[in-house]
């Protein structure tokens, strides 16, 4: 089952997600999506990182932590009731079926 996080309408929501960098120090690609983690990738992507940087995001969705040290926690700005639901943080570790998937439930009140 998903871990539940709460935020109030008009405030910022924080959805934590972390990974340990490989010994090479290379960043692991990460995607955030609205909806539970599918078999591959993320559905309804709101933010994505690659081996170098944050390479895609939409308004209101950003990273407040040090993503280059494995903190890929998502901040959603000025939330509304429509932001309620499941979010997927997917750590896209190279190799077959190696991804780490985290489903987080956001409840807006």
């Amino acid at each position: 089952s998903e871990v539940e996080y709460r935020a109030e309408v008009g405030q910022n929501a924080y959805l934590p997600c972390f990974y340990t960098l490989p010994t090479s120090g290379t960043l692991v690609p990460v995607c955030w999506g609205k909806g539970a983690c599918p078999v591959f990738e993320c559905g309804n992507v709101v933010l994505r990182t690659d081996e170098r940087d944050v390479n895609y995001w939409t308004s209101r969705y950003w990273l407040n932590g040090d993503f280059r040290k494995g903190d890929v926690s998502l901040t959603i700005e000025n939330v509304t009731l429509a932001d309620s639901g499941i979010y997927c943080c997917r750590i896209q570790i190279p190799g077959i079926m190696n991804d780490e998937k985290f489903n987080l439930k956001l409840v807006i009140k």
Epitope: R52, S59, W62, L63, G65, D66, F67, R68, E77, N78
Partner: antibody
Framework: QIQLVQSGPELKKPGETVKISCKAS????????MSWVKQAPGKGLKLMGW????????TYADDFKGRFAFSLETSASAAYLQINNLKNEDTATYFC??????????????WGQGTTLTVSS | DIVMTQSPATLSVTPGDRVSLSCRAS??????LHWYQQKSHESPRLLIK???QSISGIPSRFSGSGSGSDFTLSINSVEPEDVGVYYC?????????FGGGTKLEIK
């Protein structure tokens, strides 16, 4: 293509107010912050701060708290720098520069052409 | 605030030379170091981010290295159009201070 176009040169007297504009095009305005950078004549670059273009929340460097104000006109994809109670030492070129909103992403990938402000009695 | 110190202040080179510009931070900033080029009467242009990452559209003769508090911008084979002032920037801690710049001149 992505462009940041700033307003023209300004000549002001001490004590007056100036408002410099920076109009963005070629990308979704609210997905990037906008920074302001000061360059005094013959000197280096000094970050004044930045504004979150989605929320409108400004962040000012210590040396630019008080007389300086960042603002937005989101519908026009424009950011503004206002300086009140102008002083001679405000004479400089002011640049706007695009900044991703993420806290640890602080490189400036696109810059305006600069607005020269001269403050003289 | 983190203080960024660049050296030398001025560098006079011959076209074709390989040059190295130095930047030192007053405390460790990991690899959160960015380099900019500013030509006379122009706005700055991002050359390198995160100490060594190349930027699309920037000639491959520009490269960066370093981590912690010591960083280097290298120009593999200087061309006449490379004249200008080069600034490093702390990208780790607000207010994201810039170095004083290194002026590159052609002999």
């Amino acid at each position: 293509q992505i462009q940041l176009v700033q307003s023209g040169p300004e000549l002001k007297k001490p004590g007056e107010t100036v408002k410099i504009s920076c109009k963005a095009s070629g990308y979704t305005f609210t997905t990037y912050g906008m920074s302001w950078v000061k360059q005094a004549p013959g000197k280096g670059l000094k970050l004044m701060g930045w504004i979150n273009t989605y929320s409108g929340a400004p962040t000012y460097a210590d040396d630019f708290k008080g007389r300086f104000a960042f603002s937005l006109e989101t519908s026009a994809s424009a950011a503004y720098l206002q300086i009140n109670n102008l002083k001679n030492e405000d004479t400089a070129t002011y640049f706007c520069a695009r900044k991703p909103p993420h806290y640890y992403v602080n490189s400036f990938d696109y810059w305006g052409q600069g607005t020269t402000l001269t403050v003289s009695s | 605030d983190i203080v960024m110190t660049q050296s030398p202040a001025t560098l006079s080179v011959t076209p074709g030379d390989r040059v190295s510009l130095s930047c030192r931070a007053s405390q460790s900033i990991s690899d959160y170091l960015h380099w900019y080029q500013q030509k006379s009467h122009e706005s700055p242009r991002l050359l390198i981010k995160y100490a060594s990452q190349s930027i699309s559209g920037i000639p491959s003769r520009f490269s960066g290295s370093g981590s912690g508090s010591d960083f280097t911008l290298s120009i593999n084979s200087v061309e006449p159009e490379d004249v200008g002032v080069y600034y490093c920037q702390n990208g780790h801690s607000f207010p994201y201070t810039f170095g004083g710049g290194t002026k590159l001149e052609i002999k």
